[in-house]
């Protein structure tokens, strides 16, 4: 997935702020929606004539299967990677911003 | 982690100390510099993030500035003064869940 | 910056007996338990004694614990022994739009 090898591994909410975090978070955010337009472009240009076609489009008019599962994971590795979030202003409060984002979608 | 560029300075005279990191990414692990003069406690003085956010300690504000390269963090005292003289500590710390990383630490001595 | 303050300066225990380094920061730290108690003896960097406020570091002797939260910490060596004479610092961390930590100013333990 893309972004996941600078997800992965990272050891200590230390590594980063809060404020790097949520640029971060931003940029994966942007990510997927690009690449979900991507996805809604490719959709549209397929012919309804091929059965492969068609049940990918039906598989992919869902996002959840096709990108969004894909980002989540990686905003749900972020958020466990700093362990509680990055709020430091209210300690111990999760802010799990990827659960919020899978929820709305 | 190990620390390198310690040396005899007069004050006002920059100096750039050096860490040199092996065995883990910077891309990984931020990187604190922590020094401790003669006698005296353990001051920190900047930290560096994986994405190069740097913050400073109050006092280190316009002092120091740290950087990075792929492998190495860099401490910059840009007018050292009698008060700078210590040894400075390369940290892969202090963090949260894992544990810290001390290089041996650099001596620097600001005389005239 | 969190300022900790570190109490007492210098302490006097007895061989098997117990004591005990306070530890106060100037504000909450990073989910209220971003605390580190360190050991360190002359001409070496400080060693990682207790990370979390509480968790043992690993090859930490289990005599040494850690408690508190927000702003008071506490470090406990129960059973002192000779090799525990050394001077222990905290150090703490926040997050407001970048990291940044503090040591207290250290605890020299003698032992008797």
């Known amino acids: 997935a893309p972004f996941r090898s600078a997800l992965e591994g990272l050891p200590d909410p230390t590594a980063l702020s809060e404020k790097e975090g949520r640029l971060l978070l931003a940029a994966l955010v942007k990510a997927y929606v690009q690449r979900k337009n991507e996805l809604e472009q490719e959709q549209e240009q397929e012919t309804e004539g091929s059965s492969l076609d068609s049940s990918r489009a039906k598989r992919c008019s869902n996002l959840s299967t096709c990108v969004l599962g894909t980002y989540s994971k990686d905003l749900n590795n972020f958020h466990t990677f700093s362990g509680i979030g990055f709020g430091a202003e209210t300690p111990g409060k999760k802010r799990d911003i990827a659960s919020g984002l899978e929820r709305g979608r | 982690v190990e620390e390198s560029g310690g040396r005899l300075v007069t004050p006002g005279t920059p100096l750039t100390l050096t860490c040199t990191v092996s065995?883990?990414?910077?891309?990984?692990?931020?990187i604190n510099w922590v020094r401790q003069a003669p006698g005296k406690g353990l001051e920190w003085i900047a930290y560096?993030?994986?994405?190069?956010g740097s913050s400073y300690a109050s006092w280190a504000k316009g002092r120091f500035t740290i950087s990075k390269t792929s492998t190495t963090v860099d401490l910059r005292i840009t007018s050292p003064t009698t008060e700078d003289t210590a040894t400075y500590f390369c940290?892969?710390?202090?963090?949260?869940?894992?544990?810290?990383?001390w290089g041996p630490g650099t001596l620097v001595t600001v005389s005239s | 910056d969190p300022v900790l303050t570190q109490t007492p300066s210098s302490v006097s225990a007895a061989l098997g007996g117990t004591v005990t380094i306070n530890c106060q920061a100037s504000?909450?730290?990073?989910?209220?338990?971003?605390l580190s108690w360190y050991q360190q003896k002359p001409g070496q960097p400080p060693k990682l004694l207790i990370y979390q406020a509480s968790k043992l570091a690993s090859g930490v002797p289990s005599r040494f614990s850690g408690s508190g939260s927000g702003t008071q910490f506490t470090l406990t060596i129960s059973g002192v022994q000779c090799d525990d004479a050394a001077t222990y610092y905290c150090a703490g961390g926040i997050d407001i739009d970048g990291w940044y930590f503090g040591f207290g100013g250290g605890t020299e333990v003698v032992v008797k």
């Open positions: 560096i993030s994986i994405r190069g």
């Open positions: 940290v892969r710390g202090p963090t949260y869940q894992i544990e810290d990383i």
């Open positions: 504000q909450s730290l990073y989910n209220n338990n971003f």
């Open positions: 065995g883990f990414s910077l891309n990984r692990y931020a």
